[in-house]
């Protein structure tokens, strides 16, 4: 056959469904990989196959749209299961042929189950919530498209296990649930089931995703240093190994690039000749504000070195600040028998 | 210097409206999440309601869910809390806290007394 | 709705003395207690936050421990304006709740 644009084997995006629920994934040459969508390359001719490669197997096959009550279907660049089986597990690919033209990709499938708390390997989205915030939502994800909007599905939120009624302040709306005054108790996973009638079956779409309160862009300030500061002085003696911490508070703020970094002698610790190392940890609140610890380390020092300018540098979304460390050479203890002899008048 | 300042309170017949006023001066009441508590007679203290710093978010006891509203006039700096269909069990001291989810109610002003009564 | 209980309800000490308060969550409430004073005919002040922080302005004789459901607020030393009613309260779930209060009297 002639050859076929083959783009591989996209785990980008690794697709999982919930064992016994309906499906439908779009073949992701028209939403990755192309520049016209399927409606355009259907009336220029070009025709949609689908097939697939089981678990553990190496044998591509077509998949059998002829199953009772048409459980795998395709429909324009969607392919359906009504629902899936847990054996449905495989490389899907599509390809997009006539006979001048071809192009392909292939995406891995993963049907998985669930207890009856909702639990199991899916990969859960995560929706991140300000604390004290007024009113926020979630709203029930990769629902569209299973149902016209003529059918009206029911829908009911559960977080964990529990079925969410009369939460003091978690209110379900339909396809949306709401946190009032969102605190750090109402961190967690919340799943809707949307139950939908067709054909004379009856569907459950289950969707999981882990709710985390963060610190809310009302209290958050610009980076805070707390070392180095005015109360400590770095005395070091040539030759001791000089440590200096730089500690710093970010507030969280979505998409920030919290940046913490030092110079000396306002040059950056790569641009000079001196044996300097920079150890780094980051550490987290409950709310995701984020402190920054980097330690600078001299392992000899030198009487130079004690005369040098070392800046702490802390920037975010929210500003940028600076701090220098004091460092300075400690006075030698004076030797009894020369200086304090001589102090005391002694020849 | 922080202050809240309470007022509204007063007899009322069991039926009856009230509407009770919190004046905030010394910090911005934009920025923070206000409370309602109250204290009957002789007896502990009780959360009533809380708001959230932009007047959207508002959650109530249940004991007075329906019959009490919780607002805000962050231009004029005051808390109100509209009481409905007061009952006896309302009759208490209301208190208006400030609060952040980190300190608690961490500033009350000095409570006025509703008393419901015929 | 999380139930805290304060023992003991009433507490007798004598001035100079230690008072040891008690304070138990029905459920876990992480970190996020507080510790509050009230003296008759005065609005509550905020003594401890975050089960063992200290507010602004508070004496070091207070302190406060625990976490999860178990918590302890202690008063080092008892000086004579320290006779008050204590309670505890949660802000981990709404709706925020109160124990029902320890009045610490003179002996």
């Known amino acids: 056959s002639e050859r076929c644009d083959d783009w591989g084997l996209d785990t980008m995006r690794q697709i999982q469904v919930f064992e016994d629920e309906p499906a439908r994934i779009k073949c992701p040459l028209f939403e990755h990989f192309l520049k016209f969508n399927y409606s355009t390359a259907h009336s220029a001719g070009l025709t949609l196959i689908w097939y697939w490669t089981r678990q553990d197997r190496d044998l591509e096959e077509p998949i059998n749209f002829r199953l009772p009550e048409n459980r795998i279907s395709k429909e324009k660049d969607v392919l359906w299961f009504r629902p899936t089986l847990l054996n449905d597990t495989g490389n899907y690919t599509c390809m997009l042929r006539n006979t001048t033209y071809c192009s392909k990709v292939a995406f891995p499938l993963e049907v998985v189950q669930k207890d009856s708390c909702f639990n199991s390997p899916m990969k859960l989205p995560v929706h991140k919530l300000y604390i004290e915030y007024g009113i926020q939502r979630i709203t029930c994800p990769n629902v569209d498209g299973y149902f016209p909007s003529s059918v009206k599905p029911t829908i009911t939120w559960y977080m964990g296990c529990y079925k969410i009624q009369n939460f003091n302040n978690v209110i379900p709306e339909g396809m949306n649930l709401s946190f009032l005054i969102a605190l750090i108790s109402n961190n967690g996973n919340y799943t809707c089931v949307v139950t939908y009638p067709e054909n004379g079956r009856t569907f459950h779409l289950t969707r999981t995703l882990t709710v985390k309160v963060v610190g809310s862009p009302k209290n958050a300030v610009p980076p805070v240093i707390h070392s180095p500061n005015d109360h400590v002085v770095y005395e070091k003696e040539p030759g001791e190994e000089l440590l200096i911490p730089c500690t710093v508070y970010f507030s969280f703020l979505m998409d920030s690039r919290n940046e913490v970094w030092w110079t000396i002698d306002g040059k950056k610790p790569d641009d000079i000749t001196i044996d300097v190392t920079i150890n780094e940890s980051i550490s987290h609140s409950r709310t995701e504000d984020e402190t920054r610890t980097q330690i600078l380390s001299i392992k000899k020092v030198t009487s130079e070195d004690l005369k040098r300018s070392y800046v702490c540098h802390a920037r975010s979304a929210k500003g940028e600040v600076a701090k220098a460390a004091k460092v300075k050479q400690k006075v030698p203890a004076p030797r009894y028998t020369v200086e304090l002899a001589c102090g005391f008048g002694a020849t | 210097e922080v202050q809240l300042l309470e007022s509204g309170g007063g007899l009322v017949q069991p039926g009856g409206s009230l509407r009770l006023s919190c004046a905030a001066s010394?910090?911005?009441?934009?920025?923070?999440?206000m409370s309602w508590v109250r204290q009957a007679p002789g007896k502990g203290l009780e959360w009533v309601s809380a708001?959230?710093?932009?007047?959207?978010?508002?959650l109530y006891a249940d004991s007075v869910k329906g019959r009490f509203t919780i607002s805000r006039d962050n231009s004029k700096n005051t808390l109100y809390l509209q009481m409905n269909s007061l009952r006896a069990e309302d009759t208490a001291v209301y208190y208006c806290?400030?609060?952040?989810?980190?300190?608690?109610?961490?500033?009350w002003g000095q409570g006025t007394l509703v008393t419901v009564s015929s | 709705e999380i139930v805290m209980t304060q023992s003991p309800a009433t507490l007798s000490v004598s001035p100079g003395e230690r008072a040891t308060l008690s304070c138990r969550a029905s459920?876990?409430?992480?970190?996020?207690l507080a510790w509050y004073q009230q003296k008759p005919g005065q609005a509550p002040r905020l003594l401890i936050y975050?089960?063992?922080t200290r507010a602004t302005g508070i004496p070091a004789r207070f302190s406060g421990s625990g976490s999860g459901t178990e918590f302890t607020l202690t008063i080092s030393s008892l000086q004579s304006e320290d006779f008050a009613v204590y309670y505890c309260?949660?802000?981990?779930?709404?709706?925020?709740?109160f124990g029902q209060g320890t009045k610490v009297e003179i002996k």
């Open positions: 806290a400030r609060f952040r989810y980190y300190t608690a109610f961490d500033y």
């Open positions: 010394g910090f911005p009441l934009s920025n923070y999440g």
């Open positions: 708001i959230s710093y932009d007047g959207e978010g508002t």
């Open positions: 309260q949660q802000y981990n779930n709404w709706p925020w709740t």
């Open positions: 975050g089960a063992s």
């Open positions: 459920q876990s409430v992480s970190s996020n």
